[in-house]
């Protein structure tokens, strides 16, 4: 099943002590999915979307960006036929830099 979209969302962090907000969105035909956020291959957080929403926002407390490892990815899972869990491909990576540019 298709990979989700991932994006850093406001309020953007201006230092390593600020919280990080990362939205992960599945295609619209997968509402209510279960989402996993990874950093450097390690699970950071799991969230389930409401039944009529296609995504979630992961709120990472200040200092999370100091954890070792690579960029953030996310993935979602849905129940397919015969209640088998299906996992999406991993999203593209998103990197957090300080400060995040505002346009």
């Amino acid at each position: 099943i298709p990979a989700p979209s991932i994006r850093l969302v406001p309020p953007y962090p201006s230092s390593q002590e600020d919280p990080i907000h990362i939205a992960c969105m599945a295609p619209g035909n997968f509402p209510g999915a279960n989402f996993t956020l990874y950093r450097g291959g390690q699970v950071v957080q799991l969230l389930q979307a409401p039944t009529d929403q296609r995504g979630v926002t992961f709120n990472l407390s200040g200092g999370s960006s100091k954890a070792p490892g690579g960029p953030f990815h996310c993935q979602y899972g849905v129940l397919g036929e015969l209640n088998q869990s299906q996992l999406s491909d991993l999203s593209e990576p998103v990197n957090v830099s300080f400060p995040v540019p505002t346009w």
């Epitope: 619209g28 009529d52 929403q53």
Partner: antibody
Framework: EVQLVETGGGLIQPGRSLRLSCVAS????????MHWVRQAPGKELEWVAV????????QYAYSVKGRFTISRDNSKNTLYLEMNILGPEDTAVYFC???????????????WGQGTTVTVSS | DIQMTQSPSSLSTSVGDSVTITCRSS??????LSWFQHKPGKAPNLLIY???SLQSGVPSRFSGSGSGTDFTLTISSLQPEDFATYYC?????????FGPGTKVEIK
């Protein structure tokens, strides 16, 4: 079928105020951010404002900031746009638009209403 | 603000033809791009979101591609009901911005 119906448009004199309403049906209104988008005659579509699902976050286009206020009443499944100090440049069809299955602006847009026409003229 | 441009601004074509519309953003918007179809007096209709995802209920003859700054909408075999104006729109940053539109007319 998901539906958005805008009302409140009409002919209004410059400097006056007007309130547009948008009634939503067949979806859980309180779970979705909502937008207003407008299109002036012969012009491009212009995003006007957005409000998050719980009403806590509102954002506006520069052209309307300070004059327009977006609000919502989730108990009535209704979105509003209060427009003050109207000028001829505000003449347009105003569309109510649902966020694409999400509570904030960054989910994009999916379902649109048919629009209501606002004409500002003396 | 992010500027969106579209080409062509209009085109005349026939039923059964393949049509390609391009959209370009003034800076990278990743894949946060949607395509809408609009007919006069009607509500605009979402066709494609996230650059390439087909909206539920939209015929498979519509497809989207691209990322960064360059995007394409393709209609593989034009049907009579496809004659309309098509708009691209970015949702990476506020304010959301739209392309000027491409009007697809019957030859």
């Amino acid at each position: 079928e998901v539906q958005l119906v805008e009302t409140g448009g009409g002919l209004i004199q410059p400097g006056r105020s007007l309130r547009l309403s948008c009634v939503a049906s067949d979806f859980r209104f309180s779970n979705h951010a909502m937008h207003w988008v407008r299109q002036a005659p012969g012009k491009e579509l212009e995003w006007v404002a957005v409000i998050s699902s719980d009403g806590s976050n509102r954002q506006y286009a520069y052209s309307v900031k300070g004059r327009f206020t977006i609000s919502r009443d989730n108990s009535k499944n209704t979105l509003y746009l209060e427009m003050n100090i109207l000028g001829p440049e505000d003449t347009a069809v105003y569309f109510c638009v649902r966020s694409h299955l999400g509570p904030e602006w960054y989910y994009g847009m999916d379902v649109w209403g048919q629009g209501t026409t606002v004409t500002v003229s003396s | 603000d992010i500027q969106m441009t579209q080409s062509p601004s209009s085109l005349s074509t026939s039923v059964g033809d393949s049509v390609t519309i391009t959209c370009r953003s003034s800076q990278s918007i990743s894949t946060f791009l949607s395509w809408f179809q609009h007919k006069p007096g009607k509500a605009p209709n979402l066709l494609i979101y996230d650059a390439s995802s087909l909206q539920s209920g939209v015929p498979s003859r519509f497809s989207g591609s691209g990322s960064g700054t360059d995007f394409t909408l393709t209609i593989s075999s034009l049907q009579p009901e496809d004659f309309a104006t098509y708009y691209c729109q970015q949702s990476d940053y506020l304010p959301f911005t739209f392309g000027p539109g491409t009007k697809v007319e019957i030859k």
